[in-house]
Every structure is written in structure tokens, then in C-alpha cells.
């Protein structure tokens, strides 16, 4: 089943104390999916979008960017025929940068 | 399903404290951010406060700062809304909500209200 | 005072066009955050119309749609219907966390 989209939603953190906010939906046909956050290939976070929306926020306190590193990706879950789960493809990843430090 | 039930509201005399509680059931209470929002009798919608999934965050709405303290516990499934200095304008029906993530984003599931009056 | 600007009133006839508008600034629609939009019928709690500036809860018919551009956002809603009578709400994010609604628009359908 098709991939989710992901996008860094505002707060955007300016340090790695910061928190983290990151939306993952699904297509228009896939309400209330269980949602996956991973991070280098770790699972964050898990949510599950409400029984009429295709998405959810995920929110990562602050220093939880620091390990594991890589990118974002979030992946979901549904109930396919028989109820047998299905899940989807992973989205594209997101990375968390950080501005430079002026001294 | 979800359901959220406030309880604690009442009158009660201007300078005076009342905590509230929200009782949350059919989901996974401690994987979601939660807000208070309020109304005025006749009056919009307020947005009071908000506490992240774990607690580790919390925000005000500036007319409440330093007055009210939003909390939670995770393991009783239980958002609170502690009211101290409390002022005629604090009248207001209080509406627990569900934010759709752990993040603030939309409030996808809302409580039925729990009035609070502000009288001498 | 509300942070976000709405008109107080709008109306129109069954099977009209009306629109409401949400103005903010900056610091909230103009920083990037999400807007979304409730409707409350008199007397209950609100409900989710819009979320993330233009999707549709599942139930809520194609009549309703949203966009939103700079600082502001708005809310159309296509085919009247007497039900649509309602108060409409937007709501966003301020730069330092607090939630901010709109002051709400009461839409009469005459």
C-alpha cells in the first residue's frame, strides 16, 4: 500500500534541546491507520490517527535527536481483508538540521 | 471509542481555587498531547492549556499564566486543570480535548464541558 | 480579542456559496502552522471540520473545503444546506506554543 508523506512541522528546533514535530499522513483512503516513527531504522514513537483523519503529529522531546541518528521515516498500518495487518511503504526520510551557531 | 469526561466544576467565590479532572478512556492516553479549551457563556472558544503525551511540556494562554496549572497522570488515564486566583471572567464552560498526535496539531476529540462559575 | 480575525456573521441562501475568512500574522498562520476549523451547533461540544489547513475528516461532506495562503486562511462551504447553520471556528499555533482560535462566525442560511 502506498508510502505516507512526512514533513517537519513548525516549532522548527534550532538546537538539539529542542523539540521535535513531524507529521506523517496517509492517502485519502486510509483513516485511522496505526503510524510508525523511525529514526535510522529504530522505532520512535507510535500513534494511531483518529478513526476520521489520515494522519497524526508526532512529537519528540527534546534530545531525542541526538541517538540514534539518520533520518526520519514513518511508515503505517491497516486492517487489510481477513484482518490481517497491512502495512505500507516507508515515506521519503526527513532530516533534522540544526542552524550553525553565530559566535 | 474515545471518551472524555470532565468533572469538578461548580460555583465558586473570586479569589478562590477549583481543580478540575477529565477522565479519558477508549485510547492510549499516555501516547497523546492534551488541551483545555474553554467558552463564556455567549462567548468563542478560549484555548487554555495544553501538556504533552509525557508531561514534559506545558503551555499557557497568557490570560491564565501563572494562575492555572495543567497536569496529568498518565497511569490513572487523567488530564487536571488546577484553578487558583479565579476570577469572574474564568466563568466558562471547560472543554477537555484530544490532540490527533502526541504533537498539539488539530483537537480531533472533544468532552461534553464542565461548567465553572465565578460569583460572590 | 481574538489573535485570529473572523467575520462575526456571514449568510446566504440554500445552495449558495459563502465563505469565512481566518486572519492571523506572522507569528502564528504566517510562521508555517497548520490552521483548523470547528463547527459548533448551539449547545454541544465542538467538532472537527478541517484539519491541517485543507483536509476533510471522513463524514464531513465535499460541500466543505479550506485553504489557506500567507497569514490567513478561509473556509468555503459550496450547496447551502439548512444544516450548515452553525458558529465556525479557526484555529492555529502562536511562535511561543500557546493555541490561538478565531473570535468564530455565525452562519445563518437564509
Known amino acids: 500500500i502506498p508510502a505516507p508523506s512526512i514533513r517537519l512541522v513548525p516549532p522548527y528546533p534550532s538546537s538539539q534541546e529542542d523539540p521535535i514535530h513531524i507529521a506523517c499522513m496517509a492517502p485519502g483512503n486510509f483513516p485511522g491507520a496505526n503510524f510508525t516513527l523511525y529514526r535510522g531504522g529504530q522505532v520512535v514513537q507510535l500513534l494511531q490517527a483518529p478513526t476520521d483523519q489520515r494522519g497524526v503529529t508526532f512529537n519528540l522531546s527534546g534530545g531525542s535527536s541526538k541517538a540514534p541518528g539518520g533520518p526520519f521515516h514513518c511508515q503505517y498500518g491497516v486492517l487489510g481483508e481477513l484482518n490481517q495487518s497491512q502495512l505500507s511503504d516507508l515515506s521519503e526520510p526527513v532530516n533534522v538540521s540544526f542552524p550553525v551557531p553565530t559566535w | 471509542q474515545v471518551q472524555l469526561v470532565e468533572s469538578g466544576g461548580g460555583v465558586v467565590q473570586p479569589g478562590r481555587s477549583l481543580r478540575l479532572s477529565c477522565a479519558a478512556s477508549?485510547?492510549?492516553?499516555?501516547?497523546?498531547?492534551m488541551h483545555w479549551v474553554r467558552q463564556a457563556p455567549g462567548k468563542g472558544l478560549e484555548w487554555v492549556a495544553v501538556i504533552s503525551y509525557d508531561g514534559s511540556n506545558k503551555y499557557y494562554a497568557d490570560s491564565v499564566k501563572g494562575r492555572f496549572t495543567i497536569s496529568r497522570d498518565n497511569s490513572k488515564n487523567t488530564l487536571y486543570l488546577q484553578m487558583n486566583s479565579l476570577r469572574a471572567e474564568d466563568t466558562a464552560v471547560y472543554y477537555c480535548a484530544r490532540s490527533s498526535g502526541s504533537s498539539w496539531s488539530n483537537i480531533a476529540y472533544w468532552g461534553q464541558g464542565t461548567l465553572v462559575t465565578v460569583s460572590s | 480579542q481574538s489573535v485570529l480575525t473572523q467575520p462575526p456573521s456571514v449568510s446566504g441562501a440554500p445552495g449558495q456559496r459563502v465563505t469565512i475568512s481566518c486572519i492571523g500574522s506572522s507569528s502564528n498562520i504566517g510562521a508555517g502552522y497548520d490552521v483548523h476549523w470547528y463547527r459548533q451547533l448551539p449547545g454541544t461540544a465542538p467538532k472537527l471540520l478541517i484539519y491541517d489547513n485543507t483536509n476533510r475528516p471522513s463524514g464531513v461532506p465535499d460541500r466543505f473545503s479550506a485553504s489557506k495562503s500567507g497569514i490567513s486562511a478561509s473556509l468555503a462551504i459550496t450547496g447551502l444546506q439548512a444544516e450548515d447553520e452553525a458558529d465556525y471556528y479557526c484555529?492555529?499555533?502562536?511562535?511561543?506554543?500557546?493555541?490561538?482560535f478565531g473570535g468564530g462566525t455565525q452562519l445563518t442560511v437564509l
Open positions: 484555529q492555529s499555533y502562536d511562535s511561543n506554543l500557546s493555541g490561538v
Open positions: 477508549g485510547f492510549t492516553f499516555s501516547s497523546y498531547a
